[in-house]
Interface confidence: low
């Protein structure tokens, strides 16, 4: 329910779509600022979202989920959701150029109660409200739906994004910030504000920047899990959802001793769970099962109902079929519907892209490309044909370059190349760094099983994707003499990286000896590490031009950004260069219905997946 404290803040114009704010103070707030929504570049862009006769206005819904994993289409917006106010009324002017459309005022705010997860998925929907004389109220229709997965530390600067959905383009900024007294990149540490901006006293931690100065940090019970526990009072240890025990170190699912059902185990003294009514989850369509004294009960996701969530409450009027699917069903609010999906899509709402590459149609290590309308195989050197089934290689009478050895197998001849070389004759350098996978100016180093990034000062992570500024204070050690902090021209090669490169070189040398000894009986794993696969890995062009830049942490989204600057790495691109057949597939980012409450009377949510180009390894 909306607390009395908040009710005075809610203006009449703000959407009150039955928002119920949690009674507990949120740990922080995710903020989304929509900059523009309009026709994207290129041919076929729509002139207007409104029909020629009726004026309309826009509003937005956002849904947040934790983690980077691909989630079920029906899973809830576990981090929260928000619905915007409606924008100004827009009427199409005949003959006028297509504009950026008038937007609602203000931020969309999604409060979160627990720790900010650091990685999250978002869905942003753009809805159109047609203003007419409909007796049942205004007509709503979904114009565009974009989705993505991002890493974001709480307290960091605004991040900017462009997403395309069909012919529409959405530009927006977002950030996560902690609500006092919570601080930290996950908003899990609690701090009491210092009473005076003086130097910290004896025994207190060094002062952070002024806006985040704290007294001695709150000390939880000794041993309290830093990942799964937190405290609001000194000496206590309260567990995040899914964890239990005095120190929050026991996952809830493993606490079988607390189960009232089943026989006792002789070894543990715990009750061994017997078969229960929820075993195997009888709830369909992503419903969650809970046991009742007599049987079970399904909590159905938005859009489904019935004893086992088997009945869909969505109708064709709601536009439930995506990716060009044809909806068949009655207009009656209670009638069901069926989506007839176009080629390349499946699922009850045509929301899942058929991963035809998973059938491995490309032979001989070819790269599989699912173009939607067709499959393409990009063959490795020496192979040809629609499925790379024809072996063209014949290196008889021709030496393999760069220390490669000629190996006969399967009636054909092949070059087994030395480390770092590929191609038919081992004349091409196989460079895993060609795709520039290291973000924020990191240096890329190839080694025997892939690549390693040496990050510029101030960044960390496997691909240098994380800024190092917990609580606003740099966690980097002082730069050694002659190296200025933040100097993009100079790089520290971490000792671990040095060891890794050294180990890689030594390992490769041993491996080459091993391969050459084995001669004809060389196996696939040896061929891989000896450099046979030739691919210089490049990111495939992404269906969405997802550009993102980090900005300085001003008070709000700033506009001083080059939107067209390509990034080194698509934030949704995954580069893996450590196995023989590297293939690309397009994965539809799934949909996420139900939402949870927003703040200051804002909220939102529904369905429309967009493919993310992913390079991964088979």
């Amino acid at each position: 329910m909306v607390s009395p404290r908040m009710s005075g803040l809610l203006s009449q114009t703000v959407i009150l779509a039955l928002i119920f704010l949690p009674q507990t103070r949120p740990a922080g707030v995710f903020e989304l600022q929509i900059h523009s929504f309009g026709p994207g570049p290129g041919p076929g862009a729509p002139r207007s979202p409104c029909s020629a006769r009726l004026p309309c206005r826009l509003f937005f819904r956002v849904c947040l989920k934790p983690g980077l994993s691909e989630e079920a289409a029906e899973s809830p917006c576990a981090l929260g959701a928000a619905l915007s106010a409606r924008g100004p009324v827009y009427t199409e002017q005949p003959g006028a150029p297509a504009p950026d459309l008038p937007l609602p005022d203000g931020l969309l705010q999604v409060p979160f109660r627990d720790a900010w997860p650091g990685t999250f998925s978002f869905i942003i929907e753009t809805w159109r409200e047609e203003l007419g004389d409909q007796i049942g109220g205004p007509a709503w229709s979904l114009l565009a739906r974009v989705a993505g997965r991002r890493r974001l530390a709480a307290g960091g600067p605004w991040a900017r994004d462009i997403q395309r959905a069909g012919a529409w383009e959405l530009r927006f900024s977002y950030r996560a910030r902690c609500e006092p007294p919570a601080v930290g990149t996950a908003c899990t540490r609690l701090c009491r504000p210092r009473s005076a901006p003086s130097r910290c006293g004896p025994g207190l931690r060094p002062c952070a920047p002024l806006e985040d100065e704290c007294e001695a940090p709150l000390v939880c019970r000794a041993g309290c899990s830093p990942e799964h526990g937190f405290c609001e009072q000194p000496g206590e240890c309260r567990c995040l959802e899914g964890w239990t025990g005095p120190l929050c170190t026991v996952p809830v699912s493993t606490s079988s001793c607390l189960s009232p059902r089943g026989p006792s185990s002789a070894t543990t003294g715990c009750l061994v769970p017997g078969p229960g009514p929820c075993d195997g989850n009888p709830c369909a369509n992503g419903g969650s099962c809970s046991e009742t004294p007599r049987s079970f009960e399904c909590t159905c996701p938005r859009g489904f109902y019935g004893l086992r969530c088997e009945v869909s409450g969505v109708t064709c009027a709601d536009g439930p079929c995506f990716n060009g699917g044809l909806c068949v069903g009655g207009a009656d609010p209670d009638s069901a519907y069926i989506c007839h999906c176009p080629p390349g899509f499946q699922g009850s709402n045509c929301e899942k892209r058929v991963d035809r590459c998973s059938l491995q149609p490309c032979r001989n290590g070819g790269l599989c490309l699912d173009l939607g309308h067709a499959l393409r195989c990009r063959c490795r050197a020496g192979f040809a044909g629609p499925r790379c089934e024809h072996d063209l290689d014949d290196c008889a009478g021709r030496a393999c370059a760069n220390g490669g050895t000629c190996v006969e197998g399967g009636g054909a001849h092949r070059c087994s190349c030395a480390l770092g070389f590929g191609g038919r004759d081992c004349r091409e350098r196989a460079d895993p760094c060609a795709a520039r996978p290291c973000a924020h100016g990191g240096r890329c180093y190839a080694h025997f099983s892939g690549l390693v990034c040496a990050c510029a000062p101030g960044y960390m992570g496997a691909r240098c994707e994380f800024p190092v500024h917990p609580d606003g204070a740099s966690a980097l050690p002082a730069a050694p003499p002659g190296l200025r902090p933040g100097d993009p021209q100079r790089y520290l090669l971490p000792p671990a990286l040095g060891l890794l490169v050294a180990a890689g070189v030594a390992g490769a040398a041993l491996l080459l000896v091993h391969v050459r000894r084995r001669g004809h009986s060389q196996d696939a794993g040896s061929r891989l590490l000896a450099g046979t696969p030739e691919p210089s890995v490049h990111a495939l062009p992404d269906a969405l031009n997802n550009l993102r830049t980090q900005e300085g942490s001003g008070d709000g989204p700033s506009s001083s950004v080059d939107w067209n600057r390509p990034e080194d790495v698509d934030p949704q691109g995954i580069y893996v260069i450590s196995a023989p057949s590297i293939y690309a597939r397009e994965v539809a980012t799934p949909l996420f219905p139900p939402l949870h409450t927003g703040r200051a009377g804002q909220r939102q949510h529904l369905l429309f997946p967009y493919p993310s180009s992913i390079l991964s390894v088979k």
Epitope: Q12, W140, V314
Partner: nanobody
């Protein structure tokens, strides 16, 4: 799933008044509009009044000026104040919650206008 529970129906004389209430329980974030429909014996279900999440209202012509729909977000409820009731208003009144992507119905409450 959201449960909708109607109350307030009953027998009333022509010209009298009644207030119907509909309480929603469960996860109701996505409710786009809540409204009242009615179904008289042998007739089709028809819309009486609706109030959207943006607080705009619409009424059937036959009830304009006599019925008023309102909602109380703090109580998750929607109300229908019915004045100057007529015999032709006799029907089972259903609460309706329309989401952006689905519709839920209550069980209905009977309103009988008779002298």
């Amino acid at each position: 799933e959201v449960q909708l529970v109607e109350s307030g129906g009953g027998l009333v004389q022509p010209g009298g008044s009644l207030t119907l209430s509909c309480a929603a329980s469960g996860s109701i974030f996505s409710i786009a509009s809540m409204g009242w429909y009615r179904q008289a014996p042998g007739k089709q279900r028809e819309l009486v009044a609706v109030i959207t999440s943006f607080s705009s209202t619409n009424y059937a012509d036959s009830v304009k000026g006599r019925f008023t729909i309102s909602r109380d977000n703090a109580k998750n409820s929607v109300y229908l104040q019915m004045n100057s009731l007529r015999a032709e208003d006799t029907a089972v009144y259903y609460c309706n919650a329309r989401y952006f992507e689905r519709t839920d119905w209550g069980q209905g409450t009977l309103v009988t206008v008779s002298s």
